[in-house]
Amino acid sequence: IWELKKDVYVVELDWYPDAPGEMVVLTCDTPEEDGITWTLDQSSEVLGSGKTLTIQVKEFGDAGQYTCHKGGEVLSHSLLLLHKKEDGIWSTDILKDQKEPKNKTFLRCEAKNYSGRFTCWWLTTISTDLTFSVKSSRGSSDPQGVTCGAATLSAERVRGDNKEYEYSVECQEDSACPAAEESLPIEVMVDAVHKLKYENYTSSFFIRDIIKPDPPKNLQLKPLKNSRQVEVSWEYPDTWSTPHSYFSLTFCVQVQGKSKREKKDRVFTDKTSATVICRKNASISVRAQDRYYSSSWSEWASVPCS
Amino acid sequence: RAVPGGSSPAWTQCQQLSQKLCTLAWSAHPLVGHMDLREEGDEETTNDVPHIQCGDGCDPQGLRDNSQFCLQRIHQGLIFYEKLLGSDIFTGEPSLLPDSPVGQLHASLLGLSQLLQPEGHHWETQQIPSLSPSQPWQRLLLRFKILRSLQAFVAVAARVFAHGAATLSP
């Protein structure tokens, strides 16, 4: 058993049929010695008396809010949560496996630049009695500070018969060094509590590996005289790291016909303009990627050829 | 060239070669996620690689103030990786074909280090840890780790030279 936060404790249980469970001793936080009784949740049934209460925790019915009283007055509470371990593996019932970029990916994170600011998100089908708490650091043995905000519900989607809820959190490295080569990964830890079930999820990454620039901005077309060619121009996204002579992007320009089956013409360039042939009913799209490190491409910015 | 007197390197040449290094490093090990190498053991093997750290003066301001600290750090790393890529880690099994980008990567690391340090001038270089894994799986794991680490190193070096070529070239 360990303390998650003040008066909230997590009991780690091997979860299999007829498991013996864990013996837990609760102590009433009071100077009083006599006349103390214990109850669980809303029940008025007295579970025991005395300053300590010893219980055998085997299942969710044994978890909950234990309260010690004296003469009708509440002295203190202890909330017990369960963390299940099945076949040596901690349960992952609360969050959905996003399966990208690989199986058992519960947390996904992205950064728009090298400032040390990043966003993580996760999915669940649970709508109520759900709380999350997020901690992060750079490295684990001698951790350097990363500050995370509160997790918030950022999207709701309908998937078949189920509703899916997306939560996200923003974090910022306290003393980020955008130009340095990272040698220690960022660690992100999410504590999830659903009713009386506790689970924790972790992710470890370098900012460089989760970079995804915003799409290029101000995408414009300039027709070239007496030609089907156009000059496409664009700018670096505002959110990208500066100076651009140091934090450079590379770009992919694509001409795509109306039909998905039509052949796509693609040009790669380090410049912020390109000359392409504009076909009727086609659209021109541009996306960006770090020039020197192959992290994710941005989403496309698009304009119609007409 | 970063000669003893501390004059400027051939920023544009260095920029071109460092950008080529980035491309080669990703050709040699294109996959980001097929093996989470930080989850594997053997941490000490790549902990000794020289990283370009915050105080090394490789940020835009540091380069403007005095690029020599940064260039020395980059040179140190280039020599370190060049030695690693020429070692048994990359010559043993699993077999690399002669068209492997590792060969070109090895030559380009040497080429860039020579651009930074002509004959006769010697910066201190870092000691290479003696790594000689006997098993193919250990060797391959080490290769992947070295290449992933090299990708990060050459990305910073390429940014330095791109910025230098754009803002510090005579």
């Epitope: - | 093996m35 002669p98 492997s100 193919p136």
Partner: antibody, heavy 120, light 107 residues
Framework: QVQLVQSGAEVKKPGSSVKVSCKAS????????IHWMRQAPGQGLEWIGY????????KYNENFKGKVTITADKSTSTAYMELSSLRSEDTAVYYC?????????????WGQGTLVTVSS | DIQMTQSPSSLSASVGDRVTITCKAS??????VAWYQQKPGKVPKLLIY???TRHTGVPSRFSGSGSRTDFTLTISSLQPEDVADYFC?????????FGSGTKLEIK
């Protein structure tokens, strides 16, 4: 896109020789090794060897040394595999293939195969 | 030479079944193993490399696992179009060698 086009089927007498060609297009011919494999009827694949056109250096499976000669013609972007002293057990489909760009020998692109039949 | 012992040599399964093919290397090949699918009269097609990485465009029902000497190709839910021969291949050591193949049929 990358393409490997092999020469047509051959029927040969025991003791004779055969030269199979593999014309490459869609990439820089001298940049990559070209490998040869064979597959006898109803059997698995056997790796024969490769040529690296950049320096014309071949490497052979010891089991085929003296039996096979692999060459390349840079001017036509074509690789050749010559089999000598043919025997009935050399009857097989012969494939050329090129590996991944990372320098390891898993094969992404294959020729369509050339059936060599050795029969008296 | 490294022997790649593939089993079973043939196998019949129903549509929707989970199918597993194994390959045993005679010595350590790290994860330098690829899997190919060959349909009748066609050329081999790369499915998996580095023991577990799916090649571009290969359906997610195909997965590979294993390291050092023991490797597995799994088809999570067999489809009619999966009828083919399957080969493993080690590219760790010269001469590169292939398994003898598994003929997969639909019941």
């Amino acid at each position: 896109q990358v393409q490997l086009v092999q020469s047509g089927a051959e029927v040969k007498k025991p003791g004779s020789s055969v030269k199979v060609s593999c014309k490459a297009s869609g990439y820089t011919f001298t940049d990559q090794t070209i490998h040869w494999m064979r597959q006898a009827p109803g059997q698995g694949l056997e790796w024969i060897g490769y040529i690296y056109p950049r320096d014309d250096s071949p490497k052979y499976n010891e089991n085929f040394k003296g039996k096979v000669t692999i060459t390349a013609d840079k001017s036509t972007s074509t690789a050749y595999m010559e089999l000598s002293s043919l025997r009935s057990e050399d009857t097989a489909v012969y494939y050329c293939a090129i590996p991944d760009r990372s320098g390891y020998a898993w094969f992404i692109y294959w020729g369509q195969g050339t059936l060599v039949t050795v029969s008296s | 030479d490294i022997q790649m012992t593939q089993s079973p040599s043939s196998l019949s399964a129903s549509v929707g079944d989970r199918v597993t093919i194994t390959c045993k290397a005679s010595r350590d090949v790290a994860i330098a193993v690829a899997w190919y699918q060959q349909k009748p009269g066609k050329v081999p097609k790369l499915l998996i490399y580095w023991a577990s990485t799916r090649h571009t465009g290969v359906p997610s029902r195909f997965s590979g696992s294993g390291s050092r000497t023991d490797f597995t190709l799994t088809i999570s839910s067999l489809q009619p179009e999966d009828v083919a021969d399957y080969f493993c291949h080690q590219y760790s050591s010269y001469p590169f060698t292939f398994g003898s193949g598994t003929k997969l049929e639909i019941k």
